[in-house]
């Protein structure tokens, strides 16, 4: 039979510049002598010879003189290969091929890695910054391998994904320099963190920059928004109200108005230096241009979707700045429930039946209540499931399992907690013979 050759299943991870051992072993038979051994290490893909041992002698390295065996351990079945001063180009699969009377082989993977340097951060522009200004923050980390994953977040740890451009360039040694650029509109102040992750080493290198824009001696702009969430039905238009008090002589040329998503800082809509810069949010937003000069900075959001739900910040900068956040609560009414009864014929008192109440395309998740004909809640043996479709709207299915009495009415009420809208359906099951569906 074939000779059994053993190598590690997992890749061997080696840092650039260090030495790595590619383990390989076989089980020598009693009376085995090295004169019988043929050992070949080669690159799996190209079959390029790396190192060999034949006719009782180490034939040496065929791989830039950077490989060595463990001669004192060969007789015990240790055919491991030492690779010195590991380079990026060494990454890949190496085959250990052992022949005595029979032969066997196995491949071991070498994964090369190099840690990334602590990122350096640059801010452009880096002086005379005002709220509403757009700044470019560059995060640079050097000499890592393999390619990095880069993450940006604000001071609260919220990921910043919009307007990020990351480039990675390999140098002559194959090591990567990573440059990630975040373009962001400044708020009152903010901390921006960049995390560079080496996916092999699971090593994180991070840096942050805190930007405090210039304040005006004349004081902040007072920005007013409604305290309560704005409730909008899916598919309709919503107005997120925001207002400020313009001073005498105020002109729109002085105004920086920015609407952004509170959590991610994603730009939604802006007005700067006398011009509506338009929607940055799927072209579904609009200002009220004729009302801006009077201090009305409200935002119209068209064809509301479930995904729009959340907090929007209205940011107003004139000489100084102010901001306030308004919450959008999206809602959709649930359809009148449809009721199904199983089984639905030849029913007798004492039978167990399953009544399913289904209501569709509502938002947010519903509350479901069951009751009997006397209005007494039925809570036992109820299973309710809610599934969101692609638009984020929920279909609700509630199943009541009940033992039939002589007759009875069973009602299902589906409540939308935001709209305080109740949709209900009922089924009445009466004596013999029973057929379904009876008219409720």
């Amino acid at each position: 039979g074939a000779l059994e050759v053993q190598v590690p299943e997992d890749p061997v991870v080696a840092l650039v510049g260090t030495d790595a051992t590619l383990c390989c072993s076989f089980s020598p038979e009693p009376g085995f002598s090295l004169a019988q051994l043929n050992l070949i290490w080669q690159l799996t893909d190209t079959k390029q010879l790396v190192h060999s041992f034949a006719e009782g002698q180490d034939q040496g390295s065929a791989y830039a003189n950077r490989t060595a065996l463990f001669p004192d351990l060969l007789a015990q079945g240790n055919a491991s290969l030492r690779l010195q001063r590991v380079r990026v180009a060494d990454e890949g699969s190496f085959t250990c091929f052992v022949s005595i009377r029979d032969f066997g082989s196995a491949a071991v993977s070498l994964q090369v890695a190099a840690p990334y340097s602590k990122p350096s951060m640059t801010l452009e522009p880096n002086k005379d910054l005002r709220p509403g200004d757009t700044v470019t923050i560059t995060c640079s980390s050097y000499q890592g391998y393999p390619e990095a994953e880069v993450f940006w977040q604000d001071g609260q740890g919220v990921p910043l994904t919009g307007n990020v451009t990351t480039s990675q360039m390999a140098n002559e040694q194959g090591l990567f320099d990573v440059h990630s650029i975040l373009r962001v509109v400044l708020g009152a102040n903010g901390t921006y963190s960049c995390l560079v992750r080496n996916p092999v080493l699971q090593q994180d290198a991070h840096s942050s920059v805190t930007i405090t824009p210039q304040r005006s001696p004349t004081g902040a702009v007072e920005v007013q928004v409604p305290e309560d969430p704005v409730v909008a039905l899916v598919g309709t238009d919503a107005t997120l109200r925001c207002s400020f008090s313009p001073e005498p002589g105020f002109s729109l040329a002085q105004l920086n108005l920015i609407w952004q998503l509170t959590d991610t800082k994603q730009l939604v809509h802006s007005f700067t230096e006398g011009r509506d810069q338009g929607s940055a949010y799927a072209n579904r937003t609009a200002l009220f241009p004729d009302l801006l000069a009077q201090g009305n900075a409200s935002l119209r959001l068209q064809r509301v979707r479930v995904a729009d739900e959340g907090s929007f910040t209205c940011f107003v900068s004139i000489r100084d700045f102010g901001s306030a956040a308004v919450s959008l609560q999206v809602a959709a009414p649930y359809s009148k429930p449809s009721m199904t009864l199983e089984p639905n014929k030849d029913l007798r008192p004492g039978d167990t039946v399953t009544i399913t109440c289904s209501s569709y395309r509502g938002y947010p998740e519903a509350e479901v209540f069951w009751q009997d004909g006397q209005g007494v809640p039925l809570t036992g043996n109820v299973t309710t499931s809610q599934m969101a479709n692609e638009q984020g709207l929920f279909d609700v299915h509630s199943v009541l399992r009940v033992v039939l009495g002589a007759n009875g009415t069973y009602s299902c009420l589906v409540r939308n907690p935001v709209l305080q809208q109740d949709a209900h359906g009922s089924v009445t099951i009466t004596g013999q013979p029973m057929t379904f569906p009876p008219e409720a």
Partner: antibody, heavy 116, light 107 residues
Framework: EVQLVQSGAEVKKPGSSVKVSCKAS????????MNWVKQRPGQGLEWIGR????????RYNQNFRDKARLTVDKSSSTAYMELSSLRSEDTAVYYC?????????WGQGTTVTVSS | DIQMTQSPSSLSASVGDRVTITCRTS??????LAWYQQKPGKSPKLLIY???TLEEGVPSRFRGSGSGTHFTLTISSLQPEDFATYFC?????????FGGGTKVEIK
């Protein structure tokens, strides 16, 4: 080191056009607006307009709206100003300068002479 | 447009003199004013922004003050390299506008 290098002097006939370039280096080109400023011989400074290299959004001084057209080529980090329908009063030194409110770096200037 | 009135249009002074240049604006521009120095045949150079913030590398003998509509540039002790033309510029509104300039000459 931040540098703005402008194209060389131009002599043009009345009615013709000229395109002045400003090549930026030493900073992230898309991070700063590029402004253009006119200075007639022995006179003060006039702001022509500016362009955001990131998305090519422009703002013009109304006095130059029909005279100047600002563009950028992000791949070469170069800003351009084209002056059309040249007249003798367009004879001036034209500067590019980076920044939004403060112009912290300026090109060396390009002299445009309009003469028949 | 915001009008910028700079005075004097020119002045003669000696090395070591204290020099003051003023700039008035047609409307309140808060503190968004910058001062530039220009020497013959050269580009303007930023000296001061936000009315009183000295640009990096600019000698501390240059000082800016004021807010609203009235601003001053003071050179505490004039040096030979300071003989040049000085411009103020407002950054409150678009279009950006410059003062007419003050030429500082050797007496």
């Amino acid at each position: 080191e931040v540098q703005l290098v402008q194209s060389g002097a131009e002599v043009k006939k009345p009615g013709s056009s000229v395109k002045v370039s400003c090549k930026a280096s030493g900073y992230t080109f898309t991070a700063y607006w590029m402004n253009w400023v006119k200075q007639r011989p022995g006179q003060g400074l006039e702001w022509i307009g500016r362009i955001d290299p990131y998305d090519s959004e422009t703002r013009y001084n109304q006095n130059f709206r029909d005279k100047a057209r600002l563009t950028v080529d992000k791949s070469s980090s170069t800003a351009y100003m084209e002056l059309s329908s040249l007249r003798s009063e367009d004879t001036a030194v034209y500067y590019c300068a980076r920044g939004v409110r403060i112009f912290d770096y300026w090109g060396q200037g390009t002299t445009v002479t309009v003469s028949s | 447009d915001i009008q910028m009135t700079q005075s004097p249009s020119s002045l003669s002074a000696s090395v070591g003199d204290r020099v003051t240049i003023t700039c008035r604006t047609s409307e309140n521009i808060d503190y968004t004013l910058a001062w530039y120095q220009q020497k013959p045949g050269k580009s303007p150079k930023l000296l001061i922004y936000n009315a009183n913030t000295l640009e990096e590398g600019v000698p501390s003998r240059f000082r800016g003050s004021g807010s609203g509509t009235h601003f001053t540039l003071t050179i505490s002790s004039l040096q030979p390299e300071d003989f040049a033309t000085y411009f103020c510029k407002q950054a409150y509104d678009v279009p950006r506008t410059f003062g007419g300039g003050t030429k500082v000459e050797i007496k």
